[in-house]
């Protein structure tokens, strides 16, 4: 099961916020709220499923109260008229404290889960399809709002002349290069649903969609470096990044980041001073820790080029080298759809980018 | 691949502290919520805390809250079990477990891994 | 708390037999709810999650079901590495998030 056509997330949405889930609620759909209850004003907040702006029609009102030792509310509200409050009497969330909350849609019941916990399961009293809306208040601060769809959905694939599981194909290199073999990786459920070629003829950085023709080849002008460009729907199960390039002959060391907001969630880092690849993930100017483990020798040379093709799945990502799959690297932020910036910089020259 | 090591049991007077360790590998604590499991001799499964490190969230057992405090240093991917004022009914192995919540496209409502536990006794 | 009630605590059962465990939970748990193996001095191990899924390289004779607020865990046909204690567990948030079934020893007839 790949997510396809994710909706982009909401990145830190001033509240009240309210925003379109595009093409309203489906069975499946995984929807999280990311932030932080404040600790000054207010005892309430609310999270709300919703037909339109006006609030009149709630399909699922999620109200955590900071009253009367905590409790969470949980209704539906039909042409302005509140229905029966079922209650949890068990508060999962704290004042001054951030939060996860992941609402999965199904076809009988919301569940609820609060920081990794499943918390309450909310029966539908009216038709979710209707829900075309999320919309937060109260006293709380958002970091993001993102929505993952698992289905399966046949589109026409970006690399339309090139079955997924077939060598991608990279511009020219100077050396003889190995293109990916057949079955390095199985072939995906389902294929990628756009791509984007990152060129820089007339515009550094500038980028154009090529939702269903091959990837196109372009001449190798260089990139501005640090290359900075935004993931467009963040990263989903068989999202794929591909990156070609050389390393300068005096190269140290260089990085290719996919980040999220002030995050980094995957630090690639070649370090040719230490004959390394250090990969890590950084929260709130936080280091993880490192892993650099390799099944073969240093993949990358100083004065050569190289590719390398990031595939994300649902645990994991995984990296190929010259079409060699050289690690996996488990998910430490797992809301993809937030991961949406992709930052290169160090001692390389850039020479394709797609994402 | 997986793993999850505890380490720091041993013997230890009642109203004495001991600090237990779980160290991870293969996966990383930050996105994913740990607990301690305890199991007294010849009884069954008791759950005993967790941490969701990700948004700093934490819950305990009735049986210990107040006395155990978990923690996590996602910089050492390790998580800790600080076990304050011990009573001989805390006598047991603990065990360290990650809960998945979230693979494949699918909610995953148990504990996929375990590490090997590690025994304390508290006894005078 | 949300309590789970196991029964029966033991059983005995020839190699073959089809061999039924079940967990009542004192109030809705919605599907989550897992069942675990453990043989003496090991760790318990995940064998169905969320109610009825078969968690990875489990073998298929086992298999997990929900009816309401009662959970069963089947062993179509026993072998001999499946003598061991079977426990339920549900992770719905109440005061004690986590919570197991008193256990099923399954021993040898």
């Known amino acids: 099961m790949a997510f396809s056509g994710s909706q982009a997330p909401y990145l830190s949405p001033a509240v009240p916020f309210s925003g379109t889930i595009q093409g309203g609620l489906q069975d499946g759909l995984q929807i999280t709220v990311n932030g932080t209850v404040l600790s000054s004003s207010g005892t309430r907040f609310a999270v709300n499923f919703q037909t339109g702006f006006s609030g009149n029609d709630i399909a699922f009102h999620f109200n955590p109260r900071f009253e009367d030792g905590g409790y969470v509310v949980c209704n539906t509200r039909q042409n302005g008229s509140w229905g029966p409050e079922e209650r949890k009497t068990h508060m999962p969330f704290q004042k001054g404290m951030p939060f996860d909350l992941c609402f999965l849609v199904q076809s009988s019941d919301f569940k609820v889960m609060v920081n990794g916990i499943l918390f309450v399961q909310y029966f539908h009293r009216v038709p979710f399809h209707r829900v075309d809306t999320i919309s937060v208040n109260g006293s709380v601060q958002l970091s993001y709002i993102s929505f993952q769809n698992p289905r399966t959905v046949p589109v026409q694939p970006a690399f339309s002349t090139v079955p997924f599981s077939q060598p991608v194909c990279f511009p020219p290199r100077p050396r003889g290069r190995r293109q990916k073999p057949p079955g390095v990786w199985p072939a995906n459920p389902a294929p990628i649903t756009q791509t984007v070629i990152h060129t820089v003829q007339s515009a550094p950085g500038q980028m154009f969609s090529t939702p269903a023709i091959p990837p196109m080849m372009y001449p190798h002008p260089a990139y501005p470096m640090p290359f900075i460009t935004t993931i467009l729907g963040g990263l989903y199960p068989s999202k794929s990044i591909l990156l070609s390039g050389t390393v300068l002959p005096s190269a140290q060391r260089f990085h290719i980041n996919l980040c999220s907001g002030n995050h980094i969630a995957f630090h690639l880092n070649p370090r040719f001073d230490e004959n390394a690849v250090v990969r890590n993930t950084q929260i709130d100017n936080s280091w993880g820790s490192e892993e650099r483990s390799l099944p073969r020798k240093m993949p990358f040379v100083r004065g050569q080029s190289f590719s390398v093709w990031i595939l994300c799945e649902a645990h994991c990502l995984k990296v190929a080298v010259d079409g060699q799959h050289l690690f996996e690297y488990y998910h430490r932020l797992r809301n993809l759809p937030t991961i949406n910036r992709l930052e290169v910089g160090g001692d390389i020259q850039l020479t394709h980018v797609q994402t | 691949e997986v793993q999850l090591v505890e380490s720091g049991g041993g013997l230890v007077q009642p109203g004495g502290s001991l600090r237990l360790s779980c160290a991870a590998s293969?996966?990383?604590?930050?996105?994913?919520?740990i607990h301690w499991v305890r199991q007294a001799p010849g009884k069954g499964l008791e759950w005993v805390a967790y941490?969701?490190?990700?948004?700093?969230?934490?819950s305990y057992a009735d049986s210990v809250k107040g006395r155990f405090t978990i923690s996590a240093d996602t910089s050492k991917n390790t998580a800790y079990l600080q076990m304050n004022s011990l009573r001989a009914e805390d006598t047991a192995v603990y065990y360290c477990?990650?809960?998945?919540?979230?693979?494949?496209?699918?909610?995953?409502?148990?504990?996929?891994?375990w590490g090997q536990g590690t025994l304390v006794t508290v006894s005078s | 708390d949300i309590q789970m009630t196991q029964s029966p605590s033991s059983l005995s059962a020839s190699v073959g037999d089809r061999v039924t465990i079940t967990c009542r939970a004192s109030?809705?748990?919605?599907?989550?709810v897992a069942w675990y193996q453990q043989k003496p001095g090991k760790a318990p191990k995940l064998l169905i999650y969320s109610a009825s899924s078969l968690y990875s390289g489990v073998p298929s004779r086992f298999s997990g079901s929900r009816s309401g607020t009662d959970f069963t865990l089947t062993i179509s046909s026993l072998q001999p590495e499946d003598f061991a204690t079977y426990y339920c567990q549900q992770s719905y948030y109440d005061s004690n998030p986590i919570t197991f079934g008193q256990g099923t020893k399954v021993e040898i007839k």
């Open positions: 477990a990650r809960y998945s919540t979230y693979s494949s496209s699918k909610w995953v409502w148990g504990m996929d891994y």
């Open positions: 109030q809705s748990v919605s599907s989550a």
């Open positions: 941490i969701y490190p990700y948004s700093s969230s934490s």
């Open positions: 293969g996966f990383t604590v930050s996105s994913s919520s």
